[in-house]
Amino acid sequence: AMHVAQPAVVLANSRGTASFVCEYASPGKATEVRVTVLRQADSQVTEVCAATYMMGNELTFLDDSICTGTSSGNQVNLTIQGLRAMDTGLYICKVELMYPPPYYMGIGNGTQIYVIDPEPCPDSD
């Protein structure tokens, strides 16, 4: 399996946005890469977002995706927006080298994203 590295812990900012880098050790000269973010919570794994990109080009997520990202070489900079405290969990980066063959796939150990809902502002008189 291909090695995928990602940070162990990331704290979302006050606007509920968290960013982390997903880095993969490419065994070949991939031209097309698929990146998927999975969330693991309570032994349940769900897909958060996914994008296929051409090397050197921007990642294109679906219009309604909560993820955005950029790529540079074998690194993908992922940003997840709109997070709330209930979204705290382990976010796993899965990378697939789709083309040219051979196909390679690697899964990171996951990034624990902590989200703290901001305190509501007190009423000012």
Epitope: M2, T31, P100, P101, P102, Y103, Y104, M105
Partner: antibody
């Protein structure tokens, strides 16, 4: 049942054109890269062209570069090979094949069509 | 001229063990997986071995693959008449314009 079905072969004069089609069924076509492979009468297998699952990346053998183009329509589950400036040496059975994968594993060309015969002759 | 080199022919009698070799280089077999295909007369090729030594479901365990350095081999034990076919090795090559490379094929004849 996972299946690939080629069509579009036939007899064509040198310099002519043909478009081969490969209809896929029984699997999620848009998830797989695809290839065209040919086999001249009595000869071995020769890889011709490949295309990524999205259609964004393509490759060609030097022997067909500049004359053949590969494309796909994921909404129609169909792979194409447009062959222009055909030569006698392009005479062969043309197969489409799926580039398979499962889990962490590359599976090679795990599904093949039955082939379509292209004959280039005057 | 094929990138991977196979003997053009091989033969054996029913029940025998036959080995077919496939030789390449560091840019293909040396750094990539090897695959084997069986082509029965008048039919399309069929995947026999993937990832050097793995069999797809439905392929008998009489067929086995191995790889060492820049060479690979396909072994068929307990040879049967229905094994008479052409066998092709395939790998990927990082140094060529096209990623897929084949051997020239080996015609296996089952004698007797």
């Amino acid at each position: 049942e996972v299946q690939l079905l080629e069509s579009g072969g036939g007899l064509v004069q040198p310099g002519g054109s043909l478009r081969l089609s490969c209809a896929a069924s029984g699997f999620t076509f848009k998830a797989y890269s695809m290839s065209w492979i040919r086999q001249a009468p009595g000869k071995g297998l020769e890889w011709v062209s490949g295309i990524s699952n999205t259609g964004g990346s393509t490759d060609f053998a030097d022997s067909v570069k500049g004359r053949f183009t590969i494309s796909r329509d994921n909404s129609k589950n169909t792979l194409y090979l447009q062959m222009n400036s055909l030569r006698a040496e392009d005479t062969a059975m043309y197969y489409c094949a799926r580039l398979g994968y499962s889990g962490y594993d590359d599976r090679g060309m795990d599904v093949w069509g039955q082939g379509t015969l292209v004959t280039v002759s005057s | 001229q094929s990138v991977l080199t196979q003997p053009p022919s091989a033969s054996g009698t029913p029940g025998q063990r036959v080995t077919i070799s496939c030789s390449g280089s560091s840019s293909n077999i040396g750094s990539n997986y090897v695959y084997w295909y069986q082509q029965l007369p008048g039919t399309a090729p069929k995947l026999l071995i993937y990832g050097n030594s793995n069999r797809p479901s439905g392929v008998p365990d009489r067929f086995s693959g191995s790889k060492s350095g820049t060479s690979a081999s396909l072994a068929i034990s307990g040879l049967r008449s229905e094994d008479e076919a052409d066998y092709y090795c395939q790998s990927y090559d990082s140094s060529l314009s096209g990623p897929v490379v084949f051997g020239g094929g080996t015609k296996l004849t089952v004698l007797g």
